[in-house]
């Protein structure tokens, strides 16, 4: 009686179970009563990443430099190429089809997490006692200067965008 289901890594064709092609190979011809499944390796810049019965291999992804992309990991016959973004850019989606520039943290905000090729900058507000006077994708909030440790006094209080201004003791009101 012909099988209705086949084992793992097999497929049903013409009422018989044939072996699937291994990753990195495509199907040339199905098995018969007398012959095994015929498979061929994928060509250069092609891949298949699963046990399959595909007659064509997939093309490796192209990391288009015009979109800010570069190769992070070169594809093999069994894996696709992985693209990432050039320095200063990050992917717009998980599949990384294009890139956009990293966001800068505005004055009054510091970098909480520096951007990577796949994630944008995360900013946080500078709390009291800290400041940032620049727009930057790298700088954290910096602490206000301690006038006391310099034997000076505060002449002007700091803000989230400006440092404290220190002055000599005798200038104190």
């Amino acid at each position: 009686e012909p099988p209705t289901a086949c084992r793992e890594k097999q497929y049903l064709i013409n009422s018989q179970c044939c072996s699937l092609c291994q990753p990195g190979q495509k199907l040339v011809s199905d098995c018969t009563e007398f012959t095994e499944t015929e498979c061929l390796p994928c060509g250069e810049s092609e891949f298949l990443d699963t046990w399959n019965r595909e007659t064509r291999c997939h093309q490796h992804k192209y990391c288009d430099p015009n979109l800010g992309l570069r190769v992070q990991q070169k594809g093999t016959s069994e894996t696709d190429t992985i693209c990432t973004c050039e320095e200063g850019l990050h992917c717009t989606s998980e599949s990384c089809e294009s890139c956009v520039p990293h966001r800068s943290c505005l004055p009054g905000f510091g970098v909480k997490q520096i951007a990577t090729g796949v994630s944008d900058t995360i900013c946080e507000p500078c709390p009291v006692g800290f400041f940032s006077n620049v727009s930057s994708a790298f700088e954290k909030c910096r602490p206000w200067t301690s006038c006391e440790t310099k034997d000076l006094v505060v002449q002007q209080a700091g803000t989230n965008k400006t440092d404290v201004v220190c002055g000599p003791q005798d200038r104190q009101r």
Partner: antibody, heavy 122, light 113 residues
């Protein structure tokens, strides 16, 4: 020990101004922030503003900007909060409190004045 | 401005009870550089000024009984009284001091059941 002593209760007419004082002792007045907070009957605590007496630097709550003026006299270790254009909704207890002491590490209010009741009524 | 929301607005409890008060901020009060939480808790009794209990979300102010404790980070904070005493019946306020303007929660009144 740290002490903040405020001026007595006031009754004011709508449209007028009130000036509340807060005399500090037991710590270095010039290098510690004085904060002003108010509490209307049955309402939340509301921060109004602050001053660093040694420099005269101030911070104000935008809600009161233009109506509140905070000053300090280092020679008498006294801070003042003046609120102008009074209306009935300004009826509240006004508190001064000590804030950061120059360490940039103690912005919470560890000592409070006893409070000054300001009643605005025609 | 950072909004502070306290819950519940009141709680009835008996002496010896464990009481938990929560406070939620409209934005994170945890700063990544020093990992500090810019939050304080105060106790206020009728006709009196507020009294500092907890600062940096979990540090106990000197002289405050150890039955008071604070916890939390980011936007969610808790004040716990492990075993309520008669003198603890009061109103409790949270306050952030992350950035100006400082704001307070509207309080939780702990009443006798």
């Amino acid at each position: 020990q740290v002490q903040l002593v405020q001026s007595g209760a006031e009754v004011k007419k709508p449209g007028s101004s009130v000036k509340v004082s807060c005399k500090a002792s037991g710590y270095t007045f010039s290098t510690s922030w004085i904060e002003w907070i108010r509490q209307a009957p049955g309402q939340c605590l509301e921060w109004m503003g602050s001053i660093l007496p040694g420099s005269g630097s101030t911070n104000y709550n935008q809600k009161f900007q233009g109506r509140v003026t905070i000053t300090a006299d280092t020679s008498t270790s006294t801070a003042y909060m003046e609120l102008s254009s009074l209306r009935s909704e300004d009826t509240a207890v006004y508190y001064c409190a000590r804030g950061d002491d120059g360490s940039y590490n103690r912005w919470y209010f560890d000592h409070w004045g006893q409070g000054t009741l300001v009643t605005v009524s025609s | 401005d950072i909004q502070m929301t306290q819950s519940p607005s009141s709680v009835s409890a008996s002496v010896g009870d464990r009481v938990t008060i929560t406070c939620r901020a409209s934005q994170s009060l945890t700063f990544s550089v020093n990992q500090k939480n810019y939050l304080a808790w105060y106790q206020q009794k009728p006709g009196k000024a507020p009294k500092l209990l907890i600062y940096w979300a979990s540090s106990l102010q000197s002289g405050v009984p150890s039955r008071f404790s604070g916890s939390g980070s980011g936007t969610d904070f808790t004040l716990t009284i492990s075993s309520l005493q008669p003198e603890d019946f009061a109103t409790y306020y949270c306050q952030h001091y992350y950035s100006y303007p400082w704001t307070f929660g509207c309080g939780t009144k702990v009443e006798i059941k």
